[in-house]
């Protein structure tokens, strides 16, 4: 018996239609992406193949505008539209809240939204009961296939998920109900799940009864043969693991911002082992016609985002300096703005030792590509915002040594007065450079916020100490050369959309008053 | 199309038994459980159990544990109800419905309904 | 067993009027119940599952709603076709339970 499983993940709100690196579409011939061609692909393989399963891997919420706006109430929308049959749940759909997760997601959806190690309690658990499910069987052709969820144990550090539900070990809750599964005659078994690929496969390894993984959160690209795009592969498609009992566990993983469709087709025999699987993510490029029902929708509810731009979020009664003039060469008030949104859009007290989690950030200077004039009325719009931070990247959670961040630091001042974009801007951080220095010895003070302490103060940075930091997804990748932090970086999770964070800062504080005040020196 | 077509009316005498059939369409029977649900003059309905034809995992309503029998015949897509010692207060109009595999959801499609007359 | 307290027994109502029927769960059943319509030819169809969820090819005018073990379907304009009677019903824990009905006539 053959299935044919097709998987997205990490959509991050990307309902239109994209360019090649997944910013807003200028070209649309070159285009990529986007519900109504996704839809297009989906219904002509529906069309050919007999047993088909539309799955998403989670994080459909965060990282455009449409999110901003809607809240989830498209991604609802149109995922039914598109007719999933499976969601599990990302931790980006917890960053309204579980509020925010019920009432637009989890309310309206028309397919199952799974995780096996969310535990609900208190209050929340009557409320919530039903909405969301550790599995669920699917009637396939002439069988049932078993979905079973999961979530990144790390959300509570990631998101907002509230202090009523319990995110348990990803193995520790997915044994038992692949075991319940089981006593229901279900054979066929998929885990989908957000926890990233490291996690995906320990549960192929680990989790008895489990026969494919179906993965998100680390935006992971698969591919056998010649890639079709940028993308390179982190290992073939599937990645098979053999798990501890002997048997063959295919494992994908789709990239991410709808870009490519997961297919991937898998044999079982009478028993439900796989006998065999194949496939390749799908590059949902400009051959694929978008469906017009789907584009006409995306199109109407797109009247809705226009207006949006150019509502005021607050005001500013300062000059916010993003200019390269400033940004590149000193602290400028528009990093500063940035850093702090960045690290509130971050505070998670999570534990009474610690006053946050995360106290520091750093963001590169050439990423700020606008100042903001407050003799405007001091308005500040989403469309200025789109000016500053136009590449539509996010602002990210990393793990380094404190011995990366000195040498990112060092490379910040590397070739300093060139005016190029390396140049770090900061929160949470005291630096100090002395420029007569030779390149990679020119910092000369280090010190950082402390997070276990209840009232936040300045300490020597230590070499062998790991910390975490906030900082844009370019960075966490290597971009302007800062390759020591993608290299050395021990943990990486992907945050919020960059304009979203600073416009969410702003309305909240509804009057913004930025210095420059001595972070740098 | 899902379809749930039921045995015609029964007209039986106090104490005898009636087998009641549902024959499933337009979906693969063993991937839902079927349901029986009993509607007696001026009562409201009443759940009297489930049947998984996959796995022929059976649950009643304690009520119902005496009087009837859930069966199904996977070849024929049938899910059978016999209800047995048979006395006027089973006089009721009863219904299979399709059921939720692992019952997170409920009965999604009913049948027409068979009415059931107990009289001597 | 969980008893479900339906309200009101009956209605009158016009084409276009808001109609609203509430059902009380004798203890906590979450999210697991739905609405049922039944014409008066007997044929039963689910408009709701898991509370608010709508079933395929359900009017949008129909709705769920719920507050704590109170759980309300709406109509937020009536139509010729809704005239019927409607039933919740718990799929909490077994025995699966019905709430006593609602007829819901024209004025």
């Known amino acids: 018996w053959e299935l044919t499983i097709l998987h997205t993940n990490d959509v991050h709100s990307r309902l239109e239609q994209t360019s090649e690196d997944s910013s807003k579409c200028v070209n649309a011939s070159r285009c990529m992406g986007g519900v109504a061609r996704l839809f297009t692909k989906v219904q002509q393989i529906r069309r050919a193949e007999p047993n088909v399963l539309l799955l998403d891997a989670g994080d459909q919420y965060q990282g455009t505008i449409w999110f901003t706006v809607y809240k989830g109430a498209e991604v609802a929308h149109f995922m039914n539209a598109l007719r999933y049959d499976a969601m599990a749940l990302g931790n980006h759909e917890f960053d309204n809240g579980v509020e925010g997760l019920i009432e637009p997601l989890l309310k309206e959806a028309k397919f199952p939204i799974l995780s096996a190690n969310i535990k609900a309690k208190g209050p929340l658990a009557s409320q919530i009961s039903g909405l969301y499910l550790p599995y669920k069987v699917l009637p396939v052709g002439d069988e049932v296939v078993g979905i079973v969820g999961y979530t990144s144990k790390e959300t509570p550090f990631l998101s907002n998920p509230g202090t009523n539900l319990v995110f348990e070990d990803e193995i520790t809750a997915l044994q038992p109900e692949v075991d319940k599964l089981k006593t229901l005659n279900v054979n066929k078994i998929i885990a989908l799940g957000h926890s990233g690929f490291e996690m995906d496969k320990l549960i192929a390894q680990k989790v008895r009864g489990v026969d494919v993984v179906v993965g998100g959160h680390s935006n992971t690209f698969l591919y056998t043969g010649n890639p079709p795009s940028k993308e390179v592969p982190a290992g073939k498609y599937p990645f098979i693991v053999t798990s501890d009992d002997g048997r063959k566990v295919p494992v994908v993983q789709a990239y991410a911002f709808g870009k490519y469709l997961g297919y991937l087709k898998i044999e079982f025999d009478e028993r439900g082992n796989v006998i065999s699987s194949h496939g390749n993510p799908i590059l949902l490029n400009s051959s694929i016609p978008e469906d017009p029902s789907i584009k006409a929708d995306i199109n109407k509810w797109r009247i809705k985002l226009d207006n949006y731009s150019t509502q005021e979020l607050g005001k500013t009664i300062v000059y916010l300096d993003g200019s390269s003039q400033s940004c590149r060469f000193r602290e400028c008030n528009m990093g500063n703005l940035i850093c702090d949104a960045m690290i509130n859009n971050n505070l998670r007290h999570t534990d009474e030792m610690f006053w946050n989690h995360v106290s520091m950030c750093i963001l590169n200077g050439g990423g700020i590509r606008s100042p903001i004039d407050e003799r405007n009325n001091g308005t500040i719009t989403w469309e200025n915002l789109a000016a500053v931070l136009p590449f539509g990247g996010t602002f990210d959670l990393v793990q380094l040594k404190g011995s990366t961040l000195k040498k990112a630091f060092e490379h910040s001042v590397h070739r300093y007065g060139q005016s190029t974009g390396e140049f770090l801007q900061v929160g949470g951080i005291h630096v100090v450079y002395d420029l007569s220095r030779k390149p990679g010895d020119r910092v000369v003070k280090l010190d950082v916020l402390c997070t276990k302490c209840r009232v936040p103060s300045y300490d020597p940075l230590k070499m062998d100490e790991v910390y975490k930091v906030i900082l844009p997804n370019f960075l966490a990748n290597g971009g302007d050369g800062f390759q020591m932090i993608k290299d050395e970086l021990l943990r990486h999770d992907s945050g919020d959309q960059d304009i979203n964070v600073v416009s969410t800062y702003i309305s909240k504080m509804k009057v913004i008053y930025p210095a420059v005040e001595g972070r740098i020196k | 199309e899902v379809q749930l077509v039921q045995s015609g009316a029964e007209v039986k005498k106090p104490g005898a038994s009636v087998k009641v059939s549902c024959k499933a369409s337009g979906y693969t029977f063993t991937s839902y459980t079927m349901h029986w649900v009993r509607q007696a003059p001026g009562q409201r309905l009443e759940w009297i159990g489930y049947?998984?034809?996959?796995?022929?995992?059976?649950e009643y309503n304690q009520k119902f544990k005496d009087k009837a029998t859930l069966t199904a015949d996977t070849s024929a897509s049938t899910a059978y109800m016999e209800l047995s010692s048979l006395r006027s207060e089973d006089t009721a109009v009863y219904y299979c419905a399709r059921g939720d595999y692992d019952l997170f959801y409920d009965m999604d499609n009913w049948g027409q309904g068979t009415t059931v007359t107990v009289s001597s | 067993d969980i008893q479900m307290t339906q309200s009101p027994s009956s209605l009158s109502a016009s084409v276009g009027d808001r109609v609203t029927i509430t059902c009380r769960a004798s203890q906590d059943i979450g999210n697991s119940l739905n609405w049922l319509q039944q014409k008066p030819g007997g044929a039963i169809k689910r408009l709701i599952y898991?509370?608010?969820r709508l079933d395929s090819g359900v009017p949008s005018r129909f709705s769920g709603s719920r507050s704590g073990t109170e759980y309300t379907l709406t109509i937020s304009s009536l139509q010729p076709e809704d005239f019927a009677d409607y039933y919740c019903q718990q799929y909490a824990s077994f025995p699966w339970t019905f709430g006593g009905g609602t007829k819901v006539e024209i004025k």
């Open positions: 898991a509370t608010f």
């Open positions: 049947i998984n034809p996959n796995s022929f995992y059976i």
